[in-house]
């Protein structure tokens, strides 16, 4: 066999997206790879250029279609291929039978943005996006805030056990600066895992009400 | 707990033919692509052929390609290598493996214990 590890995953959005990463030690960081995608009952295959990432790591997006499309389903599977030319020929290093609502990385939210701040409470709300309508209401997320002096790592989580686009956050210092994340997991799927985190949102608690002399 | 258990394996003679097994615990069945790995002695471990667990999607290394062929029976939990035309430097413990993908390296998730293939000239 090669030598060496090699690692081959990808995730679907639920929409029109597979996004795919490969790795292996000791591969050549010049190495020409792709992957194929050959769905069991769909007219269409798709093809992406693998393109490095890091040391001994390559990812691509497999477009299947405009972004709200809905491409595949439940039932579907893909089979993958990581194909890799040496020389004139191509070599295959991995094949995956891939499910797409069993491998689900959703976008990460968008258009957050502050509804009301006061003193000590901010109410943020968002947006999902390219989100199945399959899910229905099946979706978690997950918040966290970013306080001065620490780092997003340090931020407790907050788990929202619903499709609940918005959040009130209480107990904040006035006059102060937070940012804001929150990220998105649909229940199903048994390698499904948290989208990325969405952009920090950045706000400002409103000063607290100076004491009558 | 996930066991791999290969069987089959034996002395033949170059030119035959032999079938080696390999019987797995339902949920790695039903869940990982199989395949089968060798190594000969003095030899780093080799791929020699893969399947999927959905679409049973194979793939042979070049030096099997033509004369071994890989299938599973998913209502036995059960993998198979037929191996037609045997020669010589066909001789290795041959391990059953299985992995969420068919990967040419040597680094798949679940092994069995290996079974002795040996082939006389």
């Known amino acids: 066999a090669v030598n060496g590890t090699s690692r081959f995953t990808c995730f679907y959005n639920s929409r029109a997206n597979i996004s795919c990463v490969w790795s292996q030690d000791g591969a050549l960081q010049d190495t020409s790879c792709q992957v194929h995608a050959w769905p069991d009952r769909r007219r269409w295959n798709q093809t992406c250029e693998l393109l490095p990432v890091s040391q001994a790591s390559w990812a691509c997006n497999l477009i299947l279609g405009t972004p709200d499309s809905q491409k595949l389903t439940a039932v579907d599977i893909v089979t993958l291929r990581v194909m890799c030319r040496e020389g004139v020929r191509w070599r295959m290093m991995a094949i995956q039978d891939f499910k797409p609502f069993e491998n689900l990385r959703l976008m990460a939210p968008i258009s957050l943005q502050v509804v009301h701040v006061e003193t000590h409470r901010c109410n943020i709300s968002w947006k999902i996006s390219q989100a199945s309508h399959y899910f229905e209401r099946h979706l978690e997320f997950e918040a966290r805030t970013l306080s001065p002096g620490h780092t997003w790592e340090e931020a407790p989580l907050m788990t929202l056990k619903q499709k609940q686009e918005w959040i009130c956050l209480e107990t904040l210092t006035p006059d102060t600066q937070y940012e804001f994340q929150v990220r998105v997991k649909p229940l199903q799927g048994e390698f499904t895992t948290w989208s990325p985190w969405s952009q920090p949102l950045a706000f400002r608690t409103k000063p607290a009400a100076l004491g009558k002399d | 707990e996930v066991q791999l258990v290969e069987s089959g394996g034996g002395l033949v003679q170059a030119g035959d033919s032999l079938r080696i097994s390999c019987a797995a615990s339902?949920?790695?069945?039903?869940?990982?692509?199989m395949g089968w790995f060798r190594q000969a002695p003095g030899k780093e471990t080799e791929f020699v052929a893969g399947?999927?667990?959905?679409?049973?999607?194979?793939h042979y290394a070049d030096s099997v390609k033509g004369r071994f062929t890989i299938s599973r029976d998913n209502a036995k939990n059960t993998m198979h290598l037929q191996m037609n035309n045997l020669k010589p430097e066909d001789t290795a413990l041959y391990y059953c493996a299985a992995d969420r993908n068919i990967k040419i390296t040597a680094d798949w998730s679940y092994w069995g214990q290996g079974t002795q293939v040996t082939v006389a000239s």
């Open positions: 399947i999927t667990h959905l679409t049973s999607t194979t």
């Open positions: 339902g949920r790695i069945f039903s869940n990982y692509a």
